[in-house]
C-alpha cells in the first residue's frame, strides 16, 4: 500500500512570497506523485511548481492559489491510488486602489450644504483599518462635520461646504502591511465668491504679421475682476499697453487681441481672475510665432521594377508641425493606390519602368512651404547590343572583345578570364562601353573570357572563346654571338613555333654549303669537332607556309678556352712586406685578368701607390695593413669564356726575436721574404 | 484472484447507445485506477478515458462529449457509456487497471 | 493533441538480431519518465514490458530494455528470439491524467 510519511497542510502565506506544501510518500514498487488544486491537475509553471513530492510557490497568488490542494500519489504499475489530506492557504494581503465617489451619483451633482460619500477602494485580508486625509492631513473620527465608516471603508461629509475642498487620500494596515490609495479625489464645493473659471486661454501660433486673439472668461458673485500680463509682468490694457505691445485690445468679455505680431510679441501672457473671496486664478497661453526650416536633400534612388520601394520625407522643423504631402509631374499622390503616399512615405508597389522621374515632396505650415526633389530611376536587367563573340587574335596585336548592352541605369561590366575576374593593369583595359581590350595578346591568352553587365535589377553574361593566332617566332631567339671550343664537340639549336610547325635550317651567311662534319638535325646545328673554319657568320631560318620564313644571324666564334698557367697560393706575410699573389692564363682569344679582392673588383686605375697588377697578371701589393688579409680572386676572361681561381692572403704581425733564437731561426710558418 | 472482465458488448446501430462493464474481483475499485483502451479490428491501440481513485474522469480528446467513464464501488465495477455511435468505432473495448492488469475485451459493433 | 510516432511501423528481423523501435511524442512526457511499453500478440490483450521509460516489469526477459527523455524513447531487444515476434506500443502519461498510445511497430520474421 502507498503511505505518506508527510502531508500538506493548511497555512499562513503572504501574498507574493514564498510557501511550500510538503508531501512524501512510501510505496512498495515506483510512483509518481501529482498535484490537484479543487480537483483538477496543477500544471507546472515558473511561479507554482512540483519540487520533487512537494508543490513549491515562488510567490504565492491571492487568486490562482484559492482552493483546496491534495497530493496524489500514484503507483502506474498496478493502478494503485492514494490522497493525502487538503490543504489550503490563508493568504494575507493588501492591495492599493483609488478614492472613489460614493454619494452623489457624479460630481457635477455636488452642491454646497449637500451629504458627500467618499469610499477607499484599500482592501485586504486580513481587513485592514482605514486613515482618511485632506491634503495631506490626518482627519481624525468624531471632528465636526464629518463621519468615519471604517466596516463600510467610507468617509461622510455633512453637510459638505467650501472649507471641506481639498484632496482626499486614504491609507490602510493591516497584519500583511500598508498601503495608500492608488488615486485620489479632488472635493471642490464652490464659494460663490470665489472667482471660478468659465473659458481659459489656449496656446496660439500665428504667422508673422497676422493677429493673434487669446480667449478668457471668469465667474463669480459678485463679478470678478480680469487681468491680462505679458511675460515681464505688464498689464496690458487699453489705456496702458508696453510699448512692444502697442497693438493690443482686451475686450469687454476678457478676449485680448494682438493685431500685426512681430517676434517681440511671442511669450507667455497671462490671465487672472479675482473674486471677492479667495486666491486669485492664473491662467497660462503661449504665443508662439510660426517656423519652417529648409529641408534635407535626398540622395537619388534607384529602384527595380517589380519590387515594393518607400521613400520617406523627412517633414522640416517648423512650428505648427508642418503637413507633408508627396507630387509627381505636379499632380498630388493620393492616400491608396499602387503609387501613393503613407504619412510622410511615398510608397510604390509593384514597380514599373515608367514610374521614373522627379517625385517633390511638399512641406507646409502657417511660416510658408518648402519642397525637395527625388529622382527615382527605374532599373532594368541590361540587354544585349552586342555578345562577345569567339575570336582568333593575333600574337602581339591588340586584341578586342565586345561585351555591349544598354539597360538604366548604365550597366556596369566585368570581365572574368577562366573564372578570375579581370582587373584592369597594363595589358587589360575595360572600355566604358564594356568591350576588353588586350593590349599585346599573348599565346596564353588563348582561353575562355566571360562577360557579367549588371545593374541594380538584375545580371546578363555571354562567354567567348579566344583563340591566339601565333605568330612565327624563335622559341628562344638564338644569342646573335656565340663561341665554340676549338678541337670540341659544339652544339648550336634554334627552334621556333608558329600557327604551323616551321621547318628549321641552317646555312653559312655567305651561302656556301656546311662541311660534311657539320649536320643540321632538325634545327640543331652540330660540330663533332671544331676547327678554325668553323668560325663566321651562319643563317637558322625558320619556315612555313601560311607565315612564310624568319631567319636568325649567328656568329660564331672559334675559341681556345681559358686554362690557368700559374694559379695564386696560400699566402702570409709580415705586415709592413710585400705580398706577390701569381697568375698568368692562357687561351684564345688571348685572355685579360681582373682581379677580386674582398668581394670588390680592383680596379687598375684606382689601386694607389700600394698595389699594382703587372702585365702577366701578378698583383703585388706593398706595406701589407691586416685589413689586406682576405680571399683575393684571379679571373681570366675573353669574349667567350671566363674563369676564376683564388687563394687566401694572411698578414701576420713579425714577431720578436727571443734570446734563445739566433739570427738564423726559421720562422714559424712558410713566408715570403722581402 | 484479482481479475477484469467487460461486458456489455456487441451489435449496435449507428447513432445508438451501449454501456459496457468491467467487473473487478479481488480488490476494491475505490483505491485505484481504471483506464478504457480500444483497438479496432487490424488497428492499434487507442486510449480512451481515465477514471481515478477519486471517480475523477479524463478523455482523449476525440471522445469528450460522446463517451462517459463512472463507477458503483458498491459493485465494484467501472462503466463505459458511449453514446452517437459511428462505424468508426467498432472495436474491441479493454479496460485495465493501472499499466499491468488488463481484461479479456469486448467487442462492439457499429453496423446498421 | 499529442501525437505519439514510433518508427519503423514494420520491421523484419531474423532470431539473434538486435531490433531498436523508437517513439517520439509532440510533447514531453509527465516526469520526462511516464513512458511504458507493451508487448501484444493477434487476439491478446496488450502485455506489459517496461514502464517509466526503463523499468522491466516482472517476468519479462532481461533482453528488453528502454531508455529516454521527455519526448524521446527507444525500446531495445538485444537478441531477438521466436517468442518476440508480436506487435510493440508505446505509451505515454501526461500532464492533467492524460494518456496516448504510439500507431504501434509490427516485428515479423525476415
Known amino acids: 500500500a502507498i503511505v505518506f510519511i508527510k502531508q500538506p497542510s493548511s497555512q499562513d502565506a503572504l501574498q507574493g512570497r514564498r510557501a511550500l506544501l510538503r508531501c512524501e510518500v512510501e510505496a512498495p514498487g515506483p510512483v509518481h506523485v501529482y498535484w490537484l488544486l479543487d480537483g483538477a491537475p496543477v500544471q507546472d509553471t515558473e511561479r507554482r511548481f512540483a519540487q520533487g513530492s512537494s508543490l513549491s510557490f515562488a510567490a504565492v497568488d491571492r487568486l490562482q492559489d484559492s482552493g483546496t490542494f491534495q497530493c496524489v500519489a500514484r503507483d502506474d504499475v498496478t493502478g494503485e491510488e492514494a490522497r493525502s489530506a487538503n490543504a489550503s492557504f490563508n493568504i494575507k494581503w493588501i492591495e492599493a486602489g483609488p478614492v472613489v465617489l460614493k454619494h452623489p451619483a457624479s460630481e457635477a451633482e455636488i452642491q454646497p450644504q449637500t451629504q458627500v460619500t467618499l469610499r477607499c477602494h484599500i482592501d485586504g485580508h486580513p481587513r485592514p483599518t482605514y486613515q482618511w486625509f485632506r491634503d495631506g492631513t490626518p482627519l481624525s473620527d468624531g471632528q465636526s462635520n464629518h463621519t468615519v465608516s471604517s466596516k463600510e471603508r467610507n468617509l461622510t461629509l455633512r453637510p459638505a461646504g467650501p472649507e471641506h475642498s481639498g484632496l482626499y487620500s486614504c491609507c490602510a494596515h493591516s497584519a500583511f502591511g500598508q498601503a495608500c490609495s492608488s488615486q485620489n479625489f479632488t472635493l471642490s464645493i464652490a464659494d460663490e465668491s470665489f472667482a471660478r473659471v468659465v473659458l481659459a486661454p489656449q496656446d496660439v501660433v500665428v504667422a508673422r504679421y497676422e493677429e493673434a486673439m487669446f480667449h478668457c472668461q471668469f465667474s463669480a458673485q459678485p463679478p470678478p475682476s480680469l487681468q491680462w500680463l505679458f511675460e515681464d509682468e505688464t498689464p496690458i490694457t487699453n489705456r496702458s499697453r508696453p510699448p512692444h505691445l502697442r497693438r493690443a485690445t482686451v475686450f469687454a468679455n476678457g478676449s485680448l487681441l494682438l493685431t500685426q505680431v512681430r517676434p517681440r510679441n511671442a511669450g507667455i501672457y497671462r490671465c487672472i481672475g479675482q473674486g471677492q473671496r479667495g486666491p486669485p486664478i492664473i491662467l497660462e497661453a503661449t504665443l508662439h510665432l510660426a517656423e519652417i526650416e529648409d529641408m534635407p536633400l535626398f540622395e537619388p534612388r534607384v529602384f527595380t521594377a517589380g519590387s515594393e520601394e518607400r521613400v520617406t520625407c523627412l517633414p522640416p522643423k517648423g512650428l505648427p508641425e508642418p503637413s507633408v504631402w508627396w507630387e509627381h509631374a505636379g499632380v498630388r499622390l493620393p492616400t491608396h493606390g499602387r503609387v501613393y503616399q503613407k504619412g510622410h512615405e511615398l510608397v510604390l508597389a509593384n514597380i514599373a519602368e515608367s514610374d521614373a522621374g522627379v517625385y517633390t515632396c511638399h512641406a507646409a505650415n502657417l511660416a510658408g512651404q518648402r519642397r525637395q526633389d527625388v529622382n527615382i530611376t527605374v532599373a532594368t536587367v541590361p540587354s544585349w547590343l552586342k555578345k562577345p563573340q569567339d575570336s582568333q587574335l593575333e600574337e602581339g596585336k591588340p586584341g578586342y572583345l565586345d561585351c555591349l548592352t544598354q539597360a538604366t541605369p548604365k550597366p556596369t561590366v566585368v570581365w572574368y578570364r577562366n573564372q578570375m575576374l579581370i582587373s584592369e593593369d597594363s595589358r587589360f583595359e575595360v572600355f566604358k562601353n564594356g568591350t576588353l581590350r588586350i593590349n599585346s595578346v599573348e599565346v596564353y591568352d588563348g582561353t575562355w573570357y566571360r562577360c557579367m553587365s549588371s545593374t541594380p535589377a538584375g545580371s546578363i553574361e555571354a562567354q567567348a572563346r579566344v583563340q591566339v593566332l601565333e605568330k612565327l617566332k624563335f622559341t628562344p631567339p638564338p644569342q646573335p654571338q656565340q663561341c665554340m671550343e676549338f678541337d670540341k664537340e659544339a652544339t648550336v639549336p634554334c627552334s621556333a613555333t608558329g600557327r604551323e610547325k616551321p621547318t628549321i635550317k641552317w646555312e653559312r651567311a655567305d651561302g656556301s654549303s656546311l662541311p660534311e662534319w657539320v649536320t643540321d638535325n632538325a634545327g640543331t646545328l652540330h660540330f663533332a669537332r671544331v676547327t678554325r673554319d668553323d668560325a663566321g657568320n651562319y643563317t637558322c631560318i625558320a619556315s612555313n607556309g601560311p607565315q612564310g620564313q624568319i631567319r636568325a644571324h649567328v656568329q660564331l666564334t672559334v675559341a681556345v678556352f681559358i686554362t690557368f698557367k700559374v694559379e695564386p697560393e696560400r699566402t702570409t706575410v709580415y705586415q709592413g712586406h710585400t705580398a706577390l699573389l701569381q697568375c698568368e692564363a692562357q687561351g684564345d682569344p688571348k685572355p685579360l685578368i681582373q682581379w677580386k679582392g674582398k668581394d670588390r673588383i680592383l680596379d687598375p686605375t684606382k689601386l694607389g701607390p700600394r698595389m699594382h697588377i703587372f702585365q702577366n697578371g701578378s698583383l703585388v701589393i706593398h706595406d701589407v695593413a691586416p685589413e689586406d688579409s682576405g680571399r683575393y680572386t684571379c679571373i681570366a676572361g675573353n669574349s667567350c669564356n671566363i674563369k676564376h681561381t683564388e687563394a687566401p692572403l694572411y698578414v701576420v704581425d713579425k714577431p720578436v726575436p727571443e734570446e734563445s733564437e739566433g739570427p738564423g731561426s726559421p720562422p714559424p710558418y712558410k713566408m715570403i721574404q722581402t | 484472484e484479482v481479475q477484469l472482465v467487460e461486458s456489455g458488448g456487441g451489435l449496435v446501430q449507428p447513432g445508438g447507445s451501449l454501456r459496457l462493464s468491467c467487473t473487478a474481483s479481488g480488490f476494491s475499485l475505490s483505491n485505484y485506477v481504471m483506464n478504457w483502451v480500444r483497438q479496432a479490428p487490424g488497428k492499434g491501440l487507442e486510449w480512451v478515458g481515465i477514471i481515478d481513485s477519486s471517480g475523477s474522469t479524463y478523455y482523449a480528446s476525440w471522445a469528450k462529449g460522446r463517451f462517459t467513464i463512472s463507477r458503483d464501488t458498491s459493485k465494484n465495477t467501472v462503466y463505459l457509456q458511449m453514446n452517437s455511435l459511428r462505424a468508426e468505432d467498432t472495436a474491441v473495448y479493454f479496460c485495465a487497471r493501472g499499466l499491468y492488469l488488463w481484461g479479456q475485451g469486448t467487442l462492439v459493433t457499429v453496423s446498421s | 493533441e499529442i501525437v505519439m510516432t514510433q518508427s519503423p511501423s514494420t520491421l523484419s528481423a531474423s532470431v539473434g538480431d538486435r531490433v531498436i523501435i523508437t517513439c517520439q511524442s509532440s510533447?514531453?512526457?509527465?516526469?520526462?519518465?511516464?513512458l511504458a511499453w507493451y508487448q501484444q500478440k493477434p487476439g491478446k490483450a496488450p502485455k506489459l514490458l517496461i514502464y517509466?521509460?526503463?523499468n522491466l516489469a516482472s517476468g519479462v526477459p532481461s533482453r528488453f530494455s528502454g531508455s529516454g527523455s521527455g519526448a524521446e524513447f527507444t525500446l531495445t531487444i538485444s537478441s531477438l528470439q521466436p517468442d518476440d515476434f508480436a506487435t510493440y506500443y508505446c505509451?505515454?502519461?501526461?500532464?492533467?491524467?492524460?494518456?496516448?498510445f504510439g500507431q504501434g511497430t509490427k516485428l515479423t520474421v525476415l
Open positions: 517509466y521509460t526503463s
Open positions: 505509451q505515454g502519461h501526461y500532464n492533467g491524467n492524460i494518456y496516448a
Open positions: 510533447q514531453s512526457v509527465y516526469n520526462n519518465n511516464l
